[in-house]
């Protein structure tokens, strides 16, 4: 039943070129190269892509031509290794080129940098962008792919093609509008925010596959697809999971051409079989390919079938529980997960996986016991505290969010997480806590039945950002422990951390709290980040500071910024009032 079984092709590069078409082929090769060599200039990448494309065309004309039988990894790796400045720019990554495939590709993958040292993307004036778009549309769009791909080396490549299509549409429409800025800027903001979210979600999928293995990813996919397609039978869900796992394994492994091709095949299969999958797919399946795949990935959950029987009969009361577990462990656990998930769209995927893990652990123990049935008879009772923990946490945090609003809620989380893991770098703590805080506006507006899947699965994505950033420069054993022990228990692990009593407070440095007039010209978001950076530093200096003390200092700081930004001589105000503020803060915190 595999969608992806194809006849062997003499030339893999010709096969993919023909399947994808020249435009998508070139775009995907550019993404692949930019995700591997993140520091290379745009022009160098374009040159490499053009060379690969010309070579692919010779293979399309004659699949038996020289080198056309080589694997894509060999062809692309050889091309990347021709870059003259590899050693100077990338250091030890150049050693990858001494290796043979598949080790060479694995080596490139290991050197992908989640936080590359690249300048922040600054958005030019609208007229400047529209001129660039009109002057050379192709180069303008390639530049977009390149800049996103190099900053997000795990971005889901076929989805990036969809973003690029929307980016092009925005410029096509808005550069002709009467008020170009009013038309374009909200669209670009939306693409930026959606793009960051898409990147983070895909990063979790790749981390799941690479750090915890295919079984972990498949379990996640069974749970999510069973919630989304509760009318589909288990065999259908299993088939979709197998195919989806192949697609994501390819994309996470840098096999972007195969990934995009297989994703298109999967979308085609889903649309051809929507009657046995979901009633919600009709609109998606009428769209063009890129929109169709995106739409399917985001489609709402179908309605649950009526009168689903209790799970207890088959998974607790049946005489065959241990026989099923012994004969086909993973299939039986998969069935349990499928049956539980399709009945519980109100649970987060990670909660469903915790329940399945509890069920597995219980059977592992009980099926070896003298009276297995007596041993596992109460297994469903063990689920109650696991369900209540995230429910209570979400209730408490949504109440706090509604009381404080997003900015102050983020600040509460900044303090909470800095106290838990003060060794983590300030920019990482600010970024992660800001994102954790966004769970409020994103999820607390939902009714109870949608809050948990929204909140806890979003938190898994954000905490994975912390994990991948921390993995690059490990500084905290507690972060390492929570990140590596269990994928599904990461959030409960971080929630359970208390103040780190072993932490030695950071030395006070007045420079950290010295501000200048440039803060006045920053956007509201940038100004918030400056204040939140100061808040993290305060907590690092005084981890035992109370909420009241920190609030008082932050209120004084806000007043100080407001006052000096209204002053005639802003710089003098910041210098003089800043010294007073630092002294007052030190006194207030007993530094």
């Amino acid at each position: 039943r595999g969608v992806f079984r194809r006849d062997a092709h003499k030339s893999e590069v010709a096969h993919r070129f023909k399947d994808l078409g020249e435009e998508n082929f070139k775009a995907l090769v550019l993404i692949a190269f930019a995700q591997y060599l993140q520091q290379c200039p745009f022009e160098d990448h374009v040159k490499l892509v053009n060379e690969v494309t010309e070579f692919a065309k010779t293979c399309v004309a004659d699949e038996s031509a020289e080198n056309c039988d080589k694997s894509l990894h060999t062809l692309f790796g050889d091309k990347l290794c021709t870059v003259a400045t590899l050693r100077e720019t990338y250091g030890e990554m150049a050693d990858c080129c001494a290796k043979q495939e598949p080790e060479r590709n694995e080596c490139f993958l290991q050197h992908k940098d989640d936080n590359p040292n690249l300048p922040r993307l600054v958005r030019p004036e609208v007229d400047v962008m529209c001129t660039a778009f009109h002057d050379n549309e192709e180069t303008f769009l390639k530049k977009y792919l390149y800049e996103i791909a190099r900053r997000h080396p795990y971005f889901y490549a076929p989805e990036l093609l969809f973003f690029a299509k929307r980016y092009k549409a925005a410029f096509t429409e808005c550069c002709q509008a009467a008020d170009k800025a009013a038309c374009l800027l909200p669209k670009l903001d939306e693409l930026r925010d959606e793009g960051k979210a898409s990147s983070a979600k895909q990063r979790l999928k790749c981390a799941s596959l690479q750090k915890f293995g295919e079984r972990a990813f498949k379990a996640w996919a069974v749970a999510r697809l069973s919630q989304r397609f509760p009318k589909a039978e288990f065999a259908e869900v299993s088939k979709l999971v197998t195919d989806l796992t192949k697609v994501h394994t390819e994309c996470c492994h840098g096999d972007l051409l195969e990934c995009a091709d297989d994703r298109a095949d999967l979308a085609k299969y889903i649309c051809e079989n929507q009657d046995s999958i979901s009633s919600k797919l009709k609109e998606c399946c009428e769209k063009p390919l890129l929109e169709k795949s995106h739409c399917i990935a985001e489609v709402e959950n179908d309605e649950m079938p009526a009168d689903l029987p209790s799970l207890a009969a088959d998974f607790v009361e049946s005489k065959d529980v241990c026989k099923n577990y012994a004969e086909a462990k993973d299939v039986f656990l998969g069935m349990f997960l499928y049956e539980y998930a399709r009945r519980h769209p109100d649970y987060s995927v990670v909660l469903l996986l915790r329940l399945a893990k509890t069920y597995e652990t219980t059977l592992e123990k009980c099926c070896a016991a003298a009276d297995p049935h007596e041993c596992y008879a109460k297994v469903f009772d063990e689920f109650k505290p696991l369900v209540e923990e995230p429910q209570n946490l979400i209730k408490q945090n949504c109440e706090l969010f509604e009381q404080l609003g997003e900015y102050k809620f983020q600040n509460a989380l900044l303090v909470r997480y800095t106290k838990k893991v003060p060794q983590v770098s300030t920019p990482t703590l600010v970024e992660v806590s800001r994102n954790l805080g966004k769970v409020g506006s994103k999820c607390c507006k939902h009714p109870e039945a949608k809050r948990m899947p929204c909140a806890e699965d979003y938190l898994s994505v954000v905490l994975n950002q912390l994990c991948v950033l921390h993995e690059k420069t490990p500084v905290s054993d507690r972060v390492t422990k929570c990140c590596t022990e269990s994928l599904v228990n990461r959030r409960p692990c971080f929630s359970a951390l208390e103040v780190d009593e072993t932490y030695v407070p950071k030395e006070f440095n007045a420079e950290t709290f010295t501000f200048h007039a440039d803060i006045c010209t920053l956007s509201e978001k940038e100004r918030q980040i400056k204040k939140q950076t100061a808040l993290v530093e305060l907590v690092k200096h005084k981890p035992k500071a109370t909420k009241e003390q920190l609030k008082a200092v932050m209120d004084d700081f806000a007043a100080f910024v407001e006052k000096c930004c209204k002053a005639d001589d802003k710089e003098t105000c910041f210098a003089e009032e800043g010294k007073k503020l630092v002294a007052a803060s030190q006194a207030a915190l007993g530094l």
Epitope: A235, P305, P309, D314, K319, D320, K323, E327, V331, M335
Partner: nanobody
Framework: QVQLIESGGGLVQAGGSLGLSCAAS????????AAWFRQAPGKEREFVAA???????TYADSVKGRFTISRDNAKSTVALQMNSLKPEDTAVYYC?????????????????WGQGTQVTVSS
């Protein structure tokens, strides 16, 4: 509980074909293993064919290549297509089901049974 009702039995000449059907009700059975057994007069009930959740089929050696078991989960039915019938295929044919991942071949492993349908093959 699962209720099973067989249909399609009858009298057929040797070399002919017959199709049996088994309709399940009471609860969804798409993940259940389903099987056909038969019992000739004065003999033990014997395994004929079984099919599991992912439509993997197994057959008794005596019917391999002649009988085909299939399932339609949308209709909650299991079918047995019998070709090249022989007089020794004469028996009461029973449909059975159980929640097992791997379809068993032993009658005692099955929890739910139909009332049976008579198949007679004349020479």
């Amino acid at each position: 509980q699962v209720q099973l009702i067989e249909s399609g039995g009858g009298l057929v000449q040797a070399g002919g074909s017959l199709g049996l059907s088994c309709a399940a009700s009471g609860r969804p059975v798409s993940n259940y293993a389903a099987a056909w057994f038969r019992q000739a007069p004065g003999k033990e009930r014997e395994f004929v064919a079984a099919i599991n959740w992912n439509k993997t089929a197994t057959y008794a050696d005596s019917v391999k290549g002649r009988f085909t078991i299939s399932r339609d989960n949308a209709k909650s039915t299991v079918a047995l297509q019998m070709n090249s019938l022989k007089p020794e295929d004469t028996a009461v044919y029973y449909c059975a089901a159980v929640f097992r991942v791997v379809a068993p071949k032993t009658q005692y492993d099955y929890d739910y049974w139909g009332q049976g349908t008579q198949v007679t093959v004349s020479s």
